[in-house]
Structures are given as C-alpha cells and as structure tokens.
C-alpha cells in the first residue's frame, strides 16, 4: 500500500500505487478527512484536500473516496472499485500535508 505526492515535498498531486502502476485519484468527494488519511500514510499528521489539482496521466485509480478520517490507510476507506471512475485528469486530487 503505497502513496506519493507529485509536484512537491508536501503539496501536490495525490497518487496511489495499484496493480504495479502509479495512478491518480479523482477529486469527486475528496475532502480533508481523505487527505488526512493519505498524508498519515506518508508520516504526516494532517492533510488538506486540494480539488482539481490536475496534471496527471495514465490510470485514474480511485474515485468517490470517503474516509472517516481515522483509518490507517486509504485502502480501508469507502471508495469505488479500483479503476472505476467518470473523471478526466483535470479532476486529479491534490493534497497539502503537514
């Protein structure tokens, strides 16, 4: 279960590793709880959701992510099945971790 931030150390596009490929997250329902879970996977304490960060390419792995905010991993959150989305890369989700 791997995630990364593209475009900066703690602020940028949120990406996840699935099926041996990196991909993006659609910003539908992407909020601060989702971002916090994402950021904690990288060792941060909090996250802020950035909508329509954009700029990604390839797979859009996740859509309609809905975390309670206390999960240990994005994988534990409610979400569409992997790769199931109605998005384009303009809608790629971003995060700012602190």
């Amino acid at each position: 279960q791997r995630v990364r931030i593209m475009g900066g150390t703690n602020r940028g596009r949120a990406e996840v590793y699935y099926n041996n490929e990196w991909g993006t997250i659609c910003d539908d329902d992407w909020d601060n709880n989702d971002a916090t879970v994402f950021c904690r996977m990288l060792g941060y304490s909090r996250g802020r959701a950035l909508s329509s960060y954009g700029g990604g390419s390839g797979n859009i792995w996740l859509d309609n992510v809905n975390c309670r905010g206390t999960e240990n991993s994005l994988w534990d959150c409610s979400k569409n099945s992997w790769g199931n989305h109605n998005c384009v890369h303009n809608e790629d989700a971003g995060v700012e971790c602190s």
């Epitope: 329902d29 909020d31 709880n33 809905n66 905010g69 240990n72």
Partner: antibody, heavy 116, light 106 residues
Framework: QVQLKESGPGLVQPSQTLSLTCTVS????????LSWVRQPPGKGLEWIGA???????DYNSALKSRLSISRDTSKSQVLLKMNSLQTEDTAIYFC??????????WGQGVMVTVSS | DIQMTQSPPVLSASVGDRVTLSCKTS??????LDWYQQKHGEAPKLLIY???NLQTGIPSRFSGSGSGTDFTLTISTLQPEDVATYYC????????FGAGTKLELK
C-alpha cells in the same frame, strides 16, 4: 473565522425527544466532520456521534438506538435528535469540528436539563 | 472498548514547575491520541493532536509524547493560566476520553 454555535431547549421532560442544532460558519460541512460531545455536570467528556462525508453517520454504540444526526449544508447546520431522554442525559452538549479524529474547534455548549 | 487511564486524577504544582501528565490505554492506539485543556465553565481546547503535534496558537511550553499505550503531556514551565482539567482522547478504535487530570496551583 471558524465558529460553531449550539441551540436548543434548556429543559426537556423525561421520555421526550431532544433536538439540538449546530450552526457553523467559516468552513464547509462538506469538507469536515461535525461531531457532538456531551459533559454531565461535574463529570468528564463523552463522544456522542458524528456526521461526515456523503452524509455518513457514526454513533456511540451505547446511545445508537436513541440517536439521529443529520445536516442541512445549505443552512450550514447539523441537527442532533435523541429520544427517550432520562435524567442521566442531563449535560452540556457541545458541537465540534473534527478533522482526522481531532476536535479542533468547539461551540460554547448548550446546557440541557432533563427534569419534570 | 478501549480503556483510558489518566494519572494522577489531581495534581498540585507550583508556578514554574515542569509538569507531566500520564495517559495509558488498554491497547495499542498507534499515534491517535490528543490532549485537551478545559478551564472551568469553558469548552475544551485542543492542545496536542496525533500524539506530539502542537495545535496552532498553543504555547510551546506544551508538548506531547508517547506511542503504543503510554502517552505523556508535559508543561515545561507551569503558568497560572494553565490551571484546568486535562483530558486525553483516543480515536484509533471508537472515540474515548480519559477521566481527566485536574491541575491545581500549590
């Protein structure tokens, strides 16, 4: 700036239903969780329940059968309903903004007394 | 349910003292523990989140540490305005507050 304010009746009869409203400003209810916490007189804090994400709710298991939490994002309000009130439900009820489990902003609280 | 044990229940200290408050949990809660300060007649205030992160606007004399089941809130130099009740709170499995430690001045 971020503000939360609870409103509702100060006195409720035993066996009746409590309705409390939390009105927020300075942030969007679609970006944060809104939780309710209560504190009986002279005692500690007890988490009641929360509403988050796409209207998902999360309740204290001991209170779940009596609780309902809903929200009206157009009015920036969250509503708490608790039925079958007893004297042990007498408490200050706080609404609080939650992020990732932490309560970073609180309302001033509303005192609710259950008595006939 | 996770049990939270705060000690001591009441602590008397003098201005300028280094004060340490303890919170123990009945099982591993990772880092999902906060500390709140509640002054008489007021709402609680978040001091420390996620074990060791100082909330914005909180004086740097407050710090948090710990992991697993043992956690500590430290006030490096006690001030008169720190008189309050301090609660730990976990959100790893459910949401539970400790019973609190009442901090008084000697």
């Amino acid at each position: 700036q971020v503000q939360l304010k609870e409103s509702g009746p100060g006195l409720v009869q035993p066996s009746q239903t409590l309705s409390l409203t939390c009105t927020v400003s300075g942030f969007s209810l679609t970006s944060y969780t809104l939780s309710w916490v209560r504190q009986p007189p002279g005692k500690g804090l007890e988490w009641i329940g929360a509403i988050w994400g796409g209207d998902n709710t999360d309740y204290n298991s001991a209170l779940k059968s009596r609780l309902s939490i809903s929200r009206d994002t157009s009015k920036s309000q969250v509503l708490l309903k608790m039925n079958s009130l007893q004297t042990e439900d007498t408490a200050i009820y706080f609404c609080t903004r939650e992020l990732g489990g932490s309560f970073d902003y609180w309302g001033q609280g509303v005192m609710v007394t259950v008595s006939s | 349910d996770i049990q939270m044990t705060q000690s001591p229940p009441v602590l008397s200290a003098s201005v300028g003292d280094r004060v340490t408050l303890s919170c123990k949990t009945s099982q591993n809660i990772n880092k999902k523990l906060d500390w709140y300060q509640q002054k008489h007649g007021e709402a609680p205030k978040l001091l420390i989140y996620y074990t060791n992160n100082l909330q914005t606007g909180i004086p740097s004399r407050f710090s948090g540490s710990g992991s697993g089941t043992d956690f500590t809130l430290t006030i490096s130099t006690l001030q008169p305005e720190d008189v309050a009740t301090y609660y730990c709170y976990q959100y790893d499995s459910g949401f539970t507050f400790g019973a609190g430690t009442k901090l008084e001045l000697k």
